[in-house]
């Protein structure tokens, strides 16, 4: 996270922890996770932890370890024979169910889905808070998680920035609607390690509540502008992949 | 298995330029971060610098600034290490290095090259 | 820069007996309560080999024989009981400023 401070887990309790590649995500559920489809495409088996502020290996230790049984990386997610060169991030998105059912507690809890009425529609400037341990201003690589605020911008924003490392042509970038644009302010941004982590938006039905409007997806570079999985067009293909694959009693 | 492959033994000429490499297999490189190690013979680590592969973001150790230039393919998995005006100073073992999931230490290294500076 | 100081530069150790390293920074590695402190072994003709994490952690495959402490600025290796293989240069570093930095090295050599 760049531009962001020092959070708690006990505030953004639905963060999770990937390891390799080093990433976040998000508890939707006792038995689910939710995360981009470009961190789990080349890690099937992916090692999770939740319920820690710090990632210190020592920390991890003594926190909540998650084990997946299976990884659903949404079909429209182009899977490429080289995905370093990835110019099209659309449908970046992936549901992991759990072996075992989380315990729930303070510091480890799921954040809602959008609802699919005009309500979670983002406009322009609606706030959204991320969280992870990525790359900040000072160091690669996070110990203690980091949170920012960003306002939702238009995608045109983003389009607007040079990519920092292009690996094509500028023009082949894909920009589609189930992308969500924000940052912009104060250089507070997502970076390279942030991936999968939810853009929470405040539920507009319940001020105590939060929903993962986005998931941290890629950028055309840290401290600008960074593009999120719009998560309310996946309503319908995360419900359905949950239902297809939940055993009897969670039903 | 993650590995690190550098490149073979250099011998060059006082005052030429020389470019190293570390190919990666078992992960990607734009998922971690590249860093570089000087060994001069019989004597101890330095460390030159780090590069991440993703937007080629860089640090050096001062040092190394105006000696050193890292770089970072994506697409053939692979880092180099390009160092100039070389001298008898550049005599050494380079090594690669990357954090793999840990935060801030090395659990891999690559094998390391020897760059040998002489007229 | 930070500064590793290592003590002794060279260190001779019955089969069996307690060898310890010492690693003194010259300012604080320490970040939000960990030690940003490394151990490595290193035997001729091999790249450094990864033994102790943020001072105390021990990397897996490495025996517990092997064990480190300290923080802040001061840090110990030890190593009991050693062994024939523990034959090697020792070395910390540091990974909590840049430009990270590496002590100048211990020879461990086994009587």
């Known amino acids: 996270i760049i531009g962001g401070s020092d959070a708690d887990i006990k505030n953004f309790p639905w963060q999770v922890f990937f390891d390799n590649p080093w990433a976040g995500g998000a508890l939707i559920n006792e038995y689910w996770v939710l995360t981009a489809a470009h961190v789990v495409e080349g890690n099937r088996e992916p090692t999770m932890y939740v319920g820690s502020t710090s990632v210190q290996t020592s920390r991890l230790a003594k926190s909540k370890m998650l084990t997946p049984e299976h990884v659903f990386i949404h079909p429209g997610w182009k899977l490429l024979e080289v995905p370093e060169g990835r110019t099209n991030f659309d449908n970046d998105i992936a549901l992991v169910r759990l072996k075992d059912p989380v315990k729930m507690g303070p510091t480890v809890s799921p954040i809602c889905l959008p609802g699919t009425s005009s309500d979670y529609n983002l406009m322009d400037g609606d706030l959204g808070l991320i969280s992870g341990w990525g790359r900040t201003e000072k160091r690669d690589r996070a110990v203690r998680l980091k949170a920012a605020r960003l306002p939702v911008a238009p995608l045109r924003k983003c389009k607007e920035v040079k990519v920092e490392k292009p690996t094509a042509d500028a023009e082949a970038y894909v920009f589609t609607p189930n992308m969500i644009c924000a940052g912009g302010e104060k250089g507070m941004d997502s970076c390279k390690g942030d991936s999968g982590g939810a853009f929470a938006v405040q539920d507009p039905n319940d001020k105590t509540k939060f929903y993962a409007a986005g998931l941290v997806s890629w950028g055309p570079q840290c401290g600008t502008y960074g593009l999120y999985t719009r998560v309310k067009n996946y309503v319908d293909w995360i419900m359905k992949t949950m239902q297809e694959n939940s055993t009897p009693r969670e039903d | 298995e993650v590995q690190l492959q550098q490149s073979g033994a250099e011998l060059v000429r006082p005052g030429a330029s020389v470019k190293l490499s570390c190919t990666a297999s078992g992960f990607n490189i734009k998922d971690d971060y590249i860093h570089w190690v000087k060994q001069r013979p019989e004597q101890g680590l330095e460390w030159i610098g780090r590069i991440d592969p993703a937007d080629d973001h860089t640090k050096y150790a001062p040092k190394f600034q105006d000696k050193a230039t890292m770089t970072a393919d994506t697409s053939s998995n692979t880092a180099c290490l390009q160092l100039n005006s070389l001298t008898s100073e550049d005599t050494a073992v380079y090594y690669c290095?990357?954090?793999?999931?840990?935060?801030?230490?090395?659990?891999?290294w690559g094998q390391g090259t020897l760059v040998s500076v002489s007229a | 820069d930070i500064v590793l100081t290592q003590t002794p530069d060279y260190l001779a150790v019955s089969l069996g007996q307690r060898a310890t390293i010492s690693c003194k920074a010259s300012q604080s590695v320490d970040y939000d309560g960990d030690s940003y402190m490394n151990w490595y072994q290193q035997k001729p003709g091999q790249p450094p080999k990864l033994l102790i994490y943020a001072a105390s952690n021990l990397e897996s495959g490495i025996p517990a024989r092997f064990s480190g402490s300290g923080s802040g600025t001061d840090f110990t290796l030890n190593i009991h009981p050693v062994e024939e293989e523990d034959a090697a240069t020792y070395y910390c570093q540091q990974s909590n400023e840049d430009p990270w930095t590496f002590g100048g090295g211990t020879k461990l050599e086994i009587k």
């Open positions: 290095a990357i954090y793999g999931s840990g935060w801030a230490w090395f659990p891999y």
